[in-house]
């Protein structure tokens, strides 16, 4: 819909859409994982949230220096975690706050499972149910 040049049109807000991938990662302990967020444009800073359990509220991710790194250029934001540990298990969300509208958009989440708690088959089955 049109705003008739009276106000910034939310439809035209450059960060009104955000795609996160992959939806699920299963890796053995010690591996490096990357998760990505794709945005319409770099019109707002991206931060990363994390929650351990499905029914928890996501919290701001505390980046562990030297092991966790976030990067953003243009319309791609990436979170890299090196040497993954069991305590990294959980769901990671990227979140973008629009510079002009202050509206916040959140990705659908990437679930990370560090191998060792269950078999790969069980994890795959869980992912199918989740989707």
């Amino acid at each position: 819909a049109r705003s008739e040049d009276r106000y910034r049109n939310p439809k035209g807000s450059a960060c009104s859409r955000i795609w996160q991938s992959p939806r699920f990662i299963a890796r053995k302990r010690g591996f490096t994982v990357k998760m990505h967020c794709y945005m319409n444009s770099a019109s707002g800073n991206v931060s990363w949230l994390w929650k351990q359990e499905m029914d928890e509220n996501p919290q701001q991710l505390k980046l562990e220096k030297g092991r966790m790194e976030e990067s953003q250029n243009e319309s791609l934001a990436t979170l890299t975690i090196q040497g993954i540990r069991f305590e990294d298990n959980g769901i990671y969300f990227c979140q973008q706050k629009c510079n002009n509208t202050s509206e916040v958009y959140q990705g659908c989440g990437t679930e990370l499972r560090v191998m060792g708690f269950s078999t790969l088959a069980q994890l795959k089955q869980r992912n199918t149910l989740k989707d």
Epitope: A1, R6, Y7, R8, A14, S102
Partner: antibody, heavy 113, light 112 residues
């Protein structure tokens, strides 16, 4: 010509809900955002939120703490604004407006016990 | 939220004389695409508001050219070159660059 015709005045008790309607005519209904603005007696203007009639996308003013809901009926070119958990401070004239350019005549909502 | 501050609160003007209303925003209203969503409304006694000016200086259709808007960033002005009796009412500036949309407190213009 563009017209926004609102429903009549309402008197409500604290804690109740009110639903105000706004019927649009004279233009392609789904082409423009519809905003809701309220004005308490003798006071200024306060933006409540807006809705895109083409897909029902809404943007609300957070100060209303999830008390406001805007909906649309494209078959009748009507937008609705519902405000719940009413309190005396919600006594105001409620306006629907097309992009704050064309305005409805206003609906007085009085909240009183 | 963006705070819009209007001055003066009220204005008493002799017909045919100029009038000026100031509007200041707590943050710049220039958006990333180069547009400044600063608008002016007039609410005549007992009526719904009517739009006068949008994008700082563009006059709405039917608005007399004695009205003009100017400004940039955070400082804006509405001018009436020669006030007429029909110009009485409360003038509001409002911004549409940042959500939520916010209005100034209003300036009441009356005729001496």
């Amino acid at each position: 010509q563009v017209q926004l015709v609102q429903s009549g005045a309402e008197v409500k008790k604290p804690g109740a809900s009110v639903k105000v309607s706004c019927k649009a005519s004279g233009y392609t209904f789904t082409d423009y955002w519809v905003n809701w603005v309220r004005q308490a007696p003798g006071q200024g203007l306060e933006w409540m939120g807006m809705i895109d009639p083409s897909d029902s996308e809404t943007h609300y003013n957070q100060m209303f703490n999830d008390r406001v809901t805007m909906t649309v009926d494209t078959s009748t070119s009507t937008v609705y604004m519902e405000l719940s958990s009413l309190r005396s401070e919600d006594t105001a004239v409620y306006y629907c407006t097309r992009s704050n350019y064309y305005w409805g005549q206003g609906t007085l909502v009085t909240v009183s016990s | 939220d963006i705070v819009m501050t209007q001055t003066p609160l009220s204005l008493s003007v002799t017909p045919g004389q100029p009038a000026s209303i100031s509007c200041k925003s707590s943050q710049s209203l220039l958006d990333s695409e180069g547009k400044t969503y600063l608008n002016w409304l007039l609410q005549k006694p007992g009526q719904s508001p009517q739009s006068l000016i949008y994008l700082v200086s563009k006059l709405d259709s039917g608005v007399p050219d004695r009205f003009s808007g100017s400004g940039s960033g955070t400082d804006f002005t509405l001018k009436i070159s020669r006030v007429e009796a029909e110009d009485v009412g409360v003038y509001y500036c409002w911004q549409g660059t940042h959500f939520p949309l916010t209005f100034g407190g209003g300036t009441k213009v009356e005729i001496k």
